[in-house]
Structures are given as C-alpha cells and as structure tokens.
C-alpha cells in the first residue's frame, strides 16, 4: 500500500484509490454542491477583520453560512451511510475474494476514511465557532448602532433645546440694546446741553478771572506802598521804643532792656512750652542769622530738629555744594536743614542724632548715635560718631570714622569715582559706602536692585531703597 | 590665594534644572557680593544676578527673574546659582564672581572656572 | 538696559605695535566702566576699573579713558601674551551689561 491517489473522476466525484501490489481498490465518494472547493481552501485560523461590515451585507452572509452548515450536515450524513453501505459490500467481496494478508490493507483504508471525517468533522466544527462569532459581532455591532442613534436623537433634542434658549436671549438683548440706544441718545442731548451752559459759564468766568487780575495788579501796587507804610511804621516805633527804653533806664536803672525771644534748637522750643509740631524759626548760634526748621515735640519725649527728611521724591536731593551748606527743600516735607546750621550748633555742645527709616513693607527702624557732631566747612563738614544703638543694624551704616561730605560738585569721598556722582546726593561717603539718604527716591516696586537709591545698608542690604528717613538731633542732656 | 572653584559640567533635559555652585577661599566670604554671570556659545557676556551673604540679600536680571534662584552658605563659604525650566538657548558656560565691594555691585576683580551646562534633549 | 556697542570685532596688530579697542554705551555711564580680558578656555580677568584704573598686576601697557558714552582700551605695545577677547562692561545702571567683544589677534 505504498500509493494512495486522490482525484476527481469525470462526473466530478472524488475518487480515493488505494494500490497494493496487483490488487488496487477505487472508493467512489459523493461531492456537496456547496462546499468549497480545493482551489480556495479553507483557514481556520483566518483573521477576522476590524472594521464593522454593513448591516445587510452581514445578514446575507450569515444566511449563506447557515445554508453551507445545513449542506455539510446532510453531505455528513450521507457520507456516513455511504461508507456504511460500501464496507458491508467490500467487507463480503474481502470474506469472499481477499486473501487473509490483505486484512490489513482494509483497516488501513479503514483507518484514512475515519481520518477523513475527522478533518470534515473538524472544519464543521471551526465554521460553527465562525459563523457564533460573527452572529455576536453582529449583535454588539446592532447595539451599538441603536446607542449612537439614541445618543444622537438626545443630542438633536439638546441643541434644539439650546437654539430656543439662545433665541430667547438674543431677541431679549436686542430689545436691551434698543433701550440702551435711545437712552444713550437722551444722554447725548443733556450732554450737549451741559456742555452748552459750561461754555457759558466758562466765558462768564474768564471775564471775571479779568476782572480779578486787574484787581490784584491794583491790590499789589496798594501791598507794595502798604509794606513801605509798615516799614517806615515799624522804624518809628523801634525809635519809639529805644527813646522809652533810654528815658526808662535813666529815671530807673533797675528795669532791664527786654530782649527779644529767640531759640537755638527744637529743645528750647519746646522748653519754653511751644509742644506742637510744626516750624519753627531758629537763630544761629553767636548770630542774628535765622532758619526755619521742623520740630519733632512728640516722639521720643520730643524736643528734636529734624534735620533731613525724605517721604516722597518731592524734592530733588541731587544739589551744589552751596545748596547743602545752606539747606533746601520744604521743612514741613522733604528738605535739608542745612550743614551749616548743623556744624555751628552741634560744635556748641554735645548733641545725639536718631535716624528713622521705613521700608516699602511697613517696617520701621532706628539708628541712635549718642554723640554727634559735624566738622567746620574748612574741613568739609566732615561727621563725627559715636555710640551706636538701636534696630537699624548693629553696625553703623554712616562709616566710621566719619568721612567728608560730597556733592556732585564737592568730590571729597575715597573712591576713584566721584560717589555723589554714582548714586547722586550729598553724603558723607566712604568708597563708597554703606549709606546714602540723599539717594534717588524710587517708589515702590522700583525700589529693588537701585545701588543710588535711599540706601541704609545694615538694614536692608545693598540695592534696596527706603521709603521715607528722618535725620533728627537734640541735646544729649534734654 | 583669592579662589572661586565651581562644580563640573552638567548635562541637562529642557524644562529641568540645574544648581550649581562656587567654593570661595582666601577671603571673608561675607566681606563680598557674589554675582554670577553666563557666557553662551558665540554670544555676549550676560549678568544674572548677585548675592550679598552678609544678609542674604538677593538682585537678579529680570531677563531671568523667576527662573533663577542665587544662595549662599556661610559656613561652607560656598554660593549656589540654580536655573529652572531649562531650555537650549540657556547651554552656557556659567561663571561665579566676586565683586570689588560689599556695598555696591560694581566690577569684577576674581572669576571661577566656569561650568559648562548643556541642555540638550 | 544700557547696550555697549564694541568697536571693532576683531583687531589684527603686529606685535609691538598699538591696539585700541572702542565701547560706546547707549547712554551716560559716568566713569562706571570696567575692561575684562579673556583668553580661550579660560574666564575673565579685570584689568581696569573706573575707565582708568589699572588692577593690581596689570602691565601698564594695559590702558583705559573715556567717561560718560565713550570709553577706550588702549595696549600700547602688543605682545603674544595679549592675543585674547577683549570685553567693556558697565556698572553705573542695573542691570550690569558687557559688550560682545573685541577679538585681538598678532597680525
């Protein structure tokens, strides 16, 4: 049995044909209509495709998997008797003609037929798994469908829903922008006739503006031979008076020449009971020379002369030599009492200074020296301290020892540079050095990374300019 | 002698950070402002930013304000320089420096090595 | 910012003869203006400070003028030693700004 031939016989039947030496044995069986040919074969592990096929086409399949199930089953059927009725027919011809040796060619052929139905039986049972799997993607596949379609018809109801809202809006707006046009022209119109009366107005006060500038021309021309009546008023009552004070003292030697009242400092000031802030007018110590000065009487027990103040940027501090010996700026807000003032008064007796500083966060601080003083201008107001206390930093931001006083136009600092120059203001810098009080004024926000700001270094570091300092003085034994 | 030693070069993904530092020795490390400056391939000389240590107080350019961050250590005498959100433009070689005076950021008298950061992806 | 405009780029000298270097600032800087020498590989060293003042160790080659926008760093006598970039930097106005450079190579 070493040849086993299968091929297709003239009416299309298969014909399975077995050989073993002279004897040769022909199985005629019977081919379906529907089952497949050999030329397309069969793969049972096929990949089934992804994409959702069309609904119609899937059920015309379906149909014709059904019809090919139905055929294999009755092709199985037949095959199965077929094979019956011809191993009853074989196995008598064997008994009859078959040699005893030839037994085992039969159960061979047996053998292939069984393995036969398996294979059929087995393909059967992988289109039935095929067509189950398919008839469940087909299922979902529907239920899907039905999903998206209800989703849709919700989302359809939901739009519809939202045009009617915002049609109802639009036309409400339209109504609002009508009403906000025809007040917007009521408005226009009133005013119109505002700007009508103001013109009125306008012209009614520039007449009268006229009318007092010539008044005050005439006023002025009055003032001036009212200040010369004054003058001439006040020389005959000094002579007056001199005439009093002579006769006086000649008839009564007793009663001394009453001298006129004048203050050195904010300490005398405010020992003569004057305990309100505000200016006050000093006189130069050994001099009829006056200056007005700011006089702190509350904090600290009070008494002191402010003799610098920045709160602002009001003023600028960038001045001449001159301008710092005699001061500047308005007492009762940024100003500079004046170096000269400053060296004649702290040179008569010992003096401390209190410097106040705030920072842009609200922070305050102080510096306290308990002895300070300025040299004479010869020796470029040059400052002298001593005694450092309080919250400003434990060490002192004014250099020690004192250093000359600069200008942008009086260059006595230690640095190459001119300081005043660099980070503009008088001070008493070093090279140069850790403060400047008469720095730019920067606001807030600017005032980070500013090296010719208001600067107090052992309080707030090296670019960080302040917000507002008060220099003060007052006698060390008030 | 006056030194200023950094830390070595570094390799860095875009939108991570790098923190690098300078050891100084020779001087009183509070006596001094610290400022660090980058180079970039072919580019200017750019300022950063500075340190004073005697109080912490911090300045930056605002070119890099936000993304740049300057410490100092006093006990190690050592300044750190940390830069966030890296992008590529920022592959530079970043110096540390001494400034001349405590008080006032003016020139620069003594320079670290330099680190090379690269920030590739 | 102040810009420092360099002037020119690079600069080719035979040695012993003098190189001048230019800065411009786009506005007044006062004496603010420092110049730095680098050479490959390695960082910035100060050679002058307030326009005009040498560093400790400079040769006295090494010079500088120029106050308000005009500044000039002048090496009178070029050695081999001195072929490096040149940088001007300005620290009267925050930020603190350089120029680009000047490239000085031995002609």
């Known amino acids: 049995y070493n040849n086993f031939r299968k091929s297709m016989d003239s009416i299309g039947k298969k014909q399975y044909q077995v050989q073993h030496g002279s004897c040769s044995y022909t199985f005629l069986l019977p081919e379906m209509d529907n089952c497949r040919s050999s030329s397309s074969p069969y793969v049972s592990n096929a990949v089934q495709r992804d994409a959702p096929l069309e609904y119609d086409d899937s059920v015309q399949r379906l149909q014709v998997l059904e019809n090919i199930m139905e055929n294999n089953t009755q092709w199985l059927m037949k095959l199965e008797n077929y094979i019956q009725d011809n191993m009853k027919k074989e196995m008598v011809e064997i008994q009859q003609n078959a040699v005893q040796n030839q037994t085992a060619v039969m159960i061979e052929i047996g053998t292939n037929l069984l393995n036969q139905t398996a294979e059929q039986t087995r393909k059967l049972t992988d289109v039935e798994a095929q067509v189950l799997n398919q008839t469940t993607r087909l299922e979902l596949q529907l239920l899907e469908h039905s999903l998206s379609t209800n989703k849709l018809e919700k989302q359809i109801l939901d739009q519809t829903s939202e045009i009617n809202k915002l049609q109802d809006k639009n036309s409400f707006l339209e109504k609002k922008v009508l009403a906000m046009e025809d007040k917007h022209i009521i408005q226009l119109q009133s005013i119109k006739e505002e700007k009508d009366q103001l013109q009125v107005l306008v012209s009614k006060q520039n007449s009268i503006i006229e009318e007092l500038e010539k008044k005050i021309v005439t006023a002025t021309v009055n003032n001036s031979v009212l200040q010369k009546q004054q003058h001439d008023l006040m020389e005959t009552v000094n002579n007056l008076l001199t005439m009093m004070s002579t006769s006086n003292s000649a008839k009564d030697p007793t009663v001394a020449k009453e001298e006129q009242i004048s203050f050195r400092d904010c300490a005398e000031v405010f020992k003569s009971g004057h305990t309100t802030n505000g200016i006050y007018t000093l006189t130069f110590p050994n001099s009829t020379e006056e200056i007005k000065a700011y006089c702190d009487m509350e904090a600290g027990g009070g008494g002191w002369t402010i003799i610098q103040r920045r709160e602002d940027g009001s003023v600028d501090f960038q001045r001449t030599w001159k301008e710092y010996k005699v001061g500047f700026g308005n007492p009762s807000g940024e100003y500079w009492l004046g170096n000269e003032f400053v060296s004649q008064l702290t040179n008569q007796q010992r003096y401390v200074l209190k410097i106040h500083l705030k920072d842009w966060e609200g922070n305050e601080a102080y510096s306290l020296y308990e002895h300070f003083y300025l040299s004479s201008e010869e020796l470029n107001y040059r400052i002298h301290l001593k005694g450092l206390t309080g919250t400003a930093g434990k060490i002192s931001s004014i250099s020690q020892p004192g250093n000359d006083f600069s200008t942008k136009d009086g260059d006595n600092d230690k640095c190459i540079c001119k300081c005043s120059q660099m980070l503009t203001g008088g001070w008493w810098f070093d090279a140069c050095g850790p403060s400047n009080l008469n720095g730019m004024y920067y606001p807030q926000r600017q005032n980070t990374n500013k090296f010719n700001g208001i600067k107090w270094y052992y309080w707030k570091g090296s670019g960080y300019s302040l917000k507002a300092t008060t220099m003060m003085i007052r006698p060390a034994d008030f | 002698q006056v030194q200023l030693v950094q830390s070595g070069a570094e390799v860095k993904k875009p939108g991570s950070s790098v923190k690098v530092s300078c050891k100084a020795s020779?001087?009183?490390?509070?006596?001094?402002?610290m400022v660090w400056v980058r180079q970039a391939p072919g580019q200017c000389l750019e300022w950063m930013g500075y340190?004073?240590?005697?109080?912490?107080?911090?300045g930056y350019n605002q070119k890099f304000e936000g993304r740049v961050t300057i410490t100092a250590d006093e006990s190690t005498s050592t300044a750190y320089m940390e830069l966030s959100s890296l992008r590529s433009e920022d592959t530079a070689v970043y110096y540390c420096?001494?400034?001349?005076?405590?008080?006032?950021?003016?020139?620069?008298?003594?320079w670290g090595q330099g680190t090379l950061v690269t920030v590739s992806s | 910012d102040i810009v420092m405009t360099q002037s020119p780029d690079s600069l080719a000298v035979s040695l012993g003869e003098r190189a001048t270097i230019n800065c411009k600032a786009s506005?007044?800087?006062?004496?603010?203006v420092a110049w730095y020498q680098q050479k490959p590989g390695q960082p910035p060293k100060l050679l002058i400070y307030?326009?005009?003042t040498r560093d400790t160790g400079v040769p006295d080659r090494f010079s500088g003028s120029g106050s308000g926008t005009d500044f000039t760093l002048t090496i009178s006598s070029l050695q081999a030693e001195d072929v490096a970039v040149y940088y001007c930097?300005?620290?009267?106005?925050?930020?603190?700004?350089f120029g680009c450079g000047t490239k000085v190579e031995i002609k």
């Open positions: 020779g001087y009183s490390f509070t006596d001094y402002n």
């Open positions: 340190i004073d240590p005697y109080n912490g107080g911090t």
């Open positions: 307030w326009a005009s």
């Open positions: 930097h300005q620290y009267s106005s925050y930020p603190p700004t």
């Open positions: 506005q007044d800087v006062y004496i603010a």
């Open positions: 420096a001494r400034t001349r005076d405590r008080y006032d950021v003016w020139y620069f008298d003594v």
